[in-house]
């Protein structure tokens, strides 16, 4: 007679990443009896919510419920019904909501309130919706990639092959690029973190980590583009903005009211003699790059060294995983290979940006024009941010690994967030029996 398969003793968790441009739902799964082991949690599903980020629902909060329905229903299908009630659901909102809160705490609260009410209607164990800090976003991204790379444990990992040559236990730094903010997080080498705001101390699996992190609000790729447009329109002689960051032949009309809607463009705001202006692409990488560099103030530094805007940055150390939009943009541009030098990346960007818009549209017929039109800017911005902002060089470029997934789990802050909130990262190295929760971070 055949043996009957024993029911799988597994647990699930759900995290919603409410970003500035969209919301994604992630479902994680792990063996119940191995909760304290490193590397056992993995992603089983990602569901991208159709529509913009939740901050865009400020004038139509009644639509939030419908907006979240498809992905929450997908979670209902993926997770066995018997597990629904004990599956935690967390929603973390990032820089898009931080910006909304800067404009109006009341409006941000209203959006989160409706989100919470919508998510409470599902049969899961809803644990709340909150705006996470930039520091948390950086820290959880760092935890995620190092957890997935098996950096927190000497023990054999649950998967056989780990990418990115990770025999040693030196952690990877994390570079995260979103639509509204960007984070840099790493363990500096024997360096005091001169700015207390940028210092984090963790004890994970019996080891202490002194981590540097900073989140640059308004320096995500979308807000950086708004900043650049607001800066450049100041010196335009009329309502035509000849823009080197868009392909030759590209044209787009922009409302001045949209340009000044975000707090990120406040420093460039001025009274313009027109309500609209037209972007006309001229496709010149060098000029685009030069324009972007003007967004980084490098003339002031109250520390031994800075990234930009007077923010402390220790000397770079170790390898870095660059994920989220760093990966999506570079993947589209076919520049994620470890073998591509910084000089080659620059050469390819020059060629890409110089391609006529009509030619680009034909070559990438399946890509939405709104996204397609911005890859020249985004790619140039990534280079500018890494090279000028964070001081990577031609020599150290090889230490940047553009990562989408690690062993099937997306690189990003969500997994680290859930691991922390479900107490699955012990402070001490677990023995054969799980430790008491009092020792967890």
């Amino acid at each position: 007679t055949q043996n009957k398969a024993l029911p799988e003793n597994v647990k699930y968790g759900i995290v919603l990443d409410a970003g500035s441009s969209h919301t994604s739902l992630y479902i994680y799964k792990w063996p119940a009896e191995k909760e304290n082991d490193t590397g056992v949690v993995h992603q089983v599903e990602e569901c991208r919510v159709k529509g913009p980020g939740i901050s865009k629902f400020v004038q139509k909060v009644n639509e939030i419920g419908i907006y979240l329905t498809d992905c929450m229903e997908r979670a209902r299908e993926v997770i066995p019904r018997s597990q629904h009630q004990e599956t935690p659901v967390y929603l973390g909102a990032t820089a898009g909501m931080r910006l909304l809160r800067m404009e109006s705490e009341e409006l941000a609260d209203r959006v989160l309130d409706v989100v919470e009410r919508s998510l409470s209607n599902y049969p899961f164990d809803f644990q709340g919706a909150r705006i996470i800090t930039g520091q948390e976003e950086g820290a959880y991204g760092w935890i995620t990639i190092n957890y997935l790379l098996g950096k927190f444990s000497q023990k054999t990992r649950w998967f056989s092959i780990v990418p990115y040559e990770t025999n040693n236990q030196e952690t990877f730094g994390a570079l995260d690029l979103g639509g509204a903010s960007t984070q840099v997080t790493f363990v500096p080498q024997n360096q005091t973190i001169e700015s207390p705001d940028n210092a984090l101390q963790f004890r994970l699996y019996g080891k202490d980590y002194n981590v540097y992190t900073h989140s640059f609000l308004c320096y995500g790729k979308d807000q950086a583009l708004w900043q650049k447009l607001a800066k450049d329109i100041q010196v335009a002689s009329n309502e035509i903005l000849r823009d080197p960051c868009f392909h030759p032949g590209y044209k787009k009309v922009v409302n001045v009211s949209d340009l000044y809607k975000t707090p990120c463009t406040k420093r460039f705001e001025m009274t313009l003699p027109f309500q609209q202006f037209e972007i006309q692409g001229i496709g010149n990488y060098q000029q685009c790059h030069q324009s972007i560099l003007e967004l980084f103030n490098t003339s002031y530094c109250p520390y031994s060294q800075c990234a930009f805007n007077g923010i402390f940055l220790p000397p770079l150390q170790g390898d870095f995983g660059a994920f989220s939009a760093f990966y999506f943009v570079m993947k589209f541009l076919n520049l994620t290979s470890e073998k591509v030098s910084q000089e080659k990346v620059t050469e390819m960007m020059k060629k890409f940006c110089a391609q006529p818009w009509e030619e680009i549209k034909t070559s990438y017929a399946g890509v939405k024009e709104k996204y397609l039109s911005e890859y020249c800017f985004s790619g140039t911005y990534i280079l500018s941010l890494l090279l000028q902002g964070y001081h990577f060089t031609a020599d150290s470029w090889e230490h940047i690994h553009f990562i989408g997934k690690i062993q099937g789990s997306d690189a990003g802050w969500t997994l680290g967030y859930m691991l922390n909130l479900t107490n699955m990262i012990p402070a001490e190295q677990p023995l054969s029996t799980p430790l008491s929760h009092s020792t967890y971070v």
Partner: antibody, heavy 116, light 110 residues
């Protein structure tokens, strides 16, 4: 501190090893460089050894020089000296592990004279 | 690649005056530039790094500026002790380059 030694008068073609001895510097955390200066001339970059033992050389120095290290010393081998290699040789510590933008601690230098 | 051209080769300045030294990179090096001071018979001394950050213990009379390919070192309120040769150095690419240093500028104080 950083101190160079091994500089002396050598005949052309005789290999010479210069040693940079460091104290209070963790060579697994810092990059080190060799720079030379011919009499009355400017500074000339030879090469570096990074914290992870990777070496970089100036284009003209490849094959002519070899840089290696132990836990407390960094060696520069001049494989086949010529009279043009007559110079003061400096060893310097980098301001980072691999993003080596500047050299913030220099030795006093050691003089190498190549003459027949 | 990444050749550094320093101008002028020599400059004379009166005590209390201001001197400006220029450094041009053949390719973009972002802010990865340092300035050094070297007096005869002495080792070089780091003055400025990341184009504009003053090294520890260096007088604020020394000011670095620029990014990309054009950089400037300005010494204001020149003193006799400033008589030296000044070098710029790029730290953007250390591999397979001819020289990371500029040719040097001799500052003569009268």
């Amino acid at each position: 501190s950083v101190e160079e030694s091994g500089g002396r008068l050598v005949t052309p073609g005789t290999p010479l090893t210069l040693t940079c001895t460091v104290s209070g510097i963790d060579l697994s955390s810092n990059a080190m460089s060799w720079v030379r200066q011919a009499p009355g001339k400017g500074l000339e970059y030879i090469g570096i050894i990074r914290n992870n033992d990777i070496t970089y050389y100036a284009s003209w120095a490849k094959g002519r020089f070899t840089i290696s290290k132990t836990s407390t010393t960094v060696d520069l081998i001049i494989t086949s000296p010529t009279t043009e290699d007559t110079a003061t040789y400096f060893c310097a510590r980098g301001g980072g592990s691999y993003s080596i933008v500047f050299w913030n601690l220099w030795g006093p230098g050691t003089l190498v004279t190549v003459s027949s | 690649a990444y050749d550094m051209t320093q101008t002028p080769a020599s400059v004379e300045v009166a005590v209390g005056g201001t001197v400006t030294i220029n450094c041009q990179a053949s390719e973009r090096i972002y802010s990865n530039l340092a300035w050094y001071q070297q007096k005869p018979g002495q080792r070089p001394k780091l003055l400025i790094y990341y184009a504009s950050t003053l090294a520890s213990g260096v007088s604020s009379r020394f000011k670095g500026s620029g990014s990309g390919t054009q950089f400037t070192l300005t010494i204001s309120g020149v003193q006799c002790a400033d008589a030296a040769t000044y070098y710029c150095q790029q730290g953007y690419s250390n591999n397979n380059v001819d020289n990371t240093f500029g040719g040097g500028t001799e500052v003569v104080v009268r």
